[in-house]
């Protein structure tokens, strides 16, 4: 029928390197047409899907997994997959997250800008997702 | 199998007020988006507003003919898609229809109800 | 706000014909469309999405084309239940705006 699924993407928001405590979104890309994204732990036991699907860009879209909260427990591999037109992809590479205090004086408090309000926005007039803030998303218990 | 069915309809004044109601079935309701679009007697489509999941917490979008008037919520437990209607207006007049998402394009609607606002 | 111009606004056919509408959009969207059919009555079904996916069970004589601003939706062979109105809506931005339609009807 049709050629190979082109591979997702995962990145995280602000970075892959977050201190206990504060929030981190996981965000995975696809082409436009996904009808559901799958956020994976290494081992594949553990994942979370989700069918809110947005733009990214004019050809890709988009679904974010947001964790409030980060512990050590969120700390690993993660990758993103899809399904389209009930054909499912290849996995993307694996993101690791690294749950660690950022500042190199662990004593003191982390100092930089609070990021619980979410993501940045992209400049670009945006999609229907708009990019709007998810603070209240899935906790370290919903996604594991 | 999808099922989605609105509720609420009816006559209202200029001025008054009317709650719609969607009830969701044949699918797990809270990782979907989902909006409520609107057609006048004898016109074309318009989409009213949308709601997505608590991933984006919940994030709200409207058309610029209704903002500051409908509040568009969801209820997941119940399962439940909600439409407050304030301030009506004679142009809100049509049948809405609820609608779910899927890949981000209007997938699955319901049977829609009539909003008739006239004095 | 994305204006998507659709044309023509009605047009008649006869069964067995090929039927193109054209949606046009104000900015590009990518393939971010939609086409939708809707009978008198009824609720709008989902034909075609991102722009030339074919949605489930809906038949493959109805085929979509374009990116970026200019988008085609073609019926092959015009069937009797096809005399419909059909609508392009594009999702890449809110407002999330449709096309005024087309009535296609029977000659």
């Known amino acids: 029928q049709e050629g190979p699924l082109p591979r997702p993407s995962i990145s995280a928001e602000p970075g892959t390197v977050i201190p206990p405590g504060r929030p981190v979104t996981i965000v995975c890309r696809g082409p436009v047409g996904v009808d559901q994204f799958r956020l994976e732990r290494e081992d594949r036991s553990k994942f979370n899907d989700t069918k809110d699907v947005s733009q990214a860009s004019p050809s890709e879209s988009e679904a974010r997994f947001r964790i409030d909260s980060v512990s050590e427990g969120n700390a690993g591999h993660y990758r993103c997959l899809y399904v389209k037109s009930t054909r499912w992809s290849e996995h993307s590479d694996y993101l690791d997250l690294v749950v660690k205090e950022t500042s190199g004086d662990t004593d003191s408090p982390v100092t930089e800008p609070d990021s619980s309000a979410g993501p940045t926005q992209r400049p670009s007039d945006n999609s229907h997702n708009e990019h709007a803030p998810a603070s209240q998303g899935l906790s370290a218990e919903h996604l594991y | 199998e999808v099922q989605l069915v609105e509720s609420g309809g009816g006559l209202v004044q200029p001025g008054g007020s009317l709650r719609l109601s969607c009830a969701a079935s044949?699918?797990?309701?809270?990782?979907?988006?989902m909006n409520w679009v609107r057609q006048a007697p004898g016109k074309g489509l318009e989409w009213v507003a949308r709601i997505r999941t608590k991933n984006y917490n919940y994030a709200t979008f409207y058309a610029d003919s209704v903002k500051d008037r409908f509040t568009i919520s969801r209820d997941d437990s119940k399962n439940s898609l909600y439409l407050q209607m304030n301030s009506l207006k004679t142009e809100d007049t049509a049948v809405y229809y609820c609608?779910?998402?899927?890949?981000?394009?209007?997938?699955?609607w319901g049977q829609g109800t009539t909003v008739t606002v006239s004095s | 706000d994305i204006q998507m111009t659709q044309s023509p606004s009605s047009l008649s056919a006869s069964v067995g014909d090929r039927v193109t509408i054209t949606c046009l959009a104000s900015q590009t969207i990518g393939t971010w469309l939609g086409w939708y059919q809707q009978k008198p009555g009824k609720a709008p079904k989902l034909l075609i999405y991102a722009a030339t996916s074919l949605a489930e069970g809906v038949p493959s004589r109805f085929s979509g084309s374009g990116s970026g601003t200019d988008f085609t939706l073609t019926i092959s062979s015009l069937q009797p239940e096809d005399f419909a109105t059909y609508y392009c809506q594009q999702l890449y931005s809110t407002p999330l705006t449709f096309g005024g339609g087309t009535k296609v009807e029977i000659k």
């Open positions: 044949g699918f797990t309701f809270n990782i979907n988006a």
């Open positions: 609608v779910r998402d899927r890949a981000g394009f209007f997938a699955y």
